[in-house]
Amino acid sequence: ESALITQQDLAPQQRAAPQQKRSSPSEGLCPPGHHISEDGRDCISCKYGQDYSTHWNDLLFCLRCTRCDSGEVELSPCTTTRNTVCQCEEGTFREEDSPEMCRKCRTGCPRGMVKVGDCTPWSDIECVHKESGTKHSGEVPAVEETVTSSPGTPASPCSLSG
């Protein structure tokens, strides 16, 4: 189950503080990988593989590690200071406006269009009109004559928070 809150949502203004493993809060904040105790006097370590915190913070608990959904691959595991990084499986992508699921990439472009961008974990194939060079909206026509293509190799991992 994916966490619905990220520390980007919650993080207070970050303040520079000396690096330290575990100790009392510095200027009221605990280091990444820790949260503050109920009485605000101690920094308590997050549990490796279970929860994390990415910034100096005064959160009263650590944030839950994201579990990658089926249809996703785990690029890097959750540590006490960094959330799990999940990426859509090859041939699927995640759109910004529907980040909750990976969608299948189209196998080709509609008639009269040419593919200019491969399927990546964060984008569908990109099609443009042969003549004008304008981008296709991404809506697949009901009847489609396609130019088949193989999913592209991602250039870099798509880091998703929460």
Partner: antibody, heavy 122, light 112 residues
Amino acid sequence: QVQLVQSGAEVKKPGASVKVSCKASGYSFIGYFMNWMKQSPGMSLEWIGRFNPYNGDTFYNQKFKGKATLTVDKSTSTAYMELSSLRSEDTAVYFCGRSAYYFDSGGYFDYWGQGTLVTVSS
Amino acid sequence: DIVMTQSPLSLPVTPGEPASISCRSSQSLVHSNGNTYLHWYLQKPGQSPQLLIYKVSNRFSGVPDRFSGSGSGTDFTLKISRVEAEDVGVYYCSQSTHVPWTFGPGTKVEIK
């Protein structure tokens, strides 16, 4: 706008239990603690404890451990407080109240429910 | 537990006049992080409490600027510069420096 709407008044017999609800709207329910307070007749307020809807953790005032049990239903954005083994001294108005997840800003309640009167009488 | 005391417990006021409520704690409310977690609430007749002031002197949103908070250590004050009829009710101070959080007994403000 932020609203906390509590269930109606209850009359219970000594030894019984009661469950008071607090339905939240107008904000992300999992983004804040839900606290519960007790106000006895003609008395001040006492903080009972709080529930973390994000991870399910509870934190109680030692005085109310074993008396109050805090839960939530995230699907309906509703917090609950169950009071067990009721006695006459549990007669009070109970309030829910929202607080932040941070130590520095988490010790005060920016929004409150309207209160639920629980009367314990034989 | 930290004991909060307030004085006076009852305060008759005249509209347009200033009013002042004192709150004392049994221990210092200065946290080891340097902040002081003392807050004020107003409970109007038949209503739930509402936040007025947090962390000694910060007015909550929508609170009129006639309300102000001050103090340090164990002694705190809530001032109303010019009382209005709508300000009647019970004023509570509260602390969250020490667990469990505790409230004062309340000061009842009523129009003379």
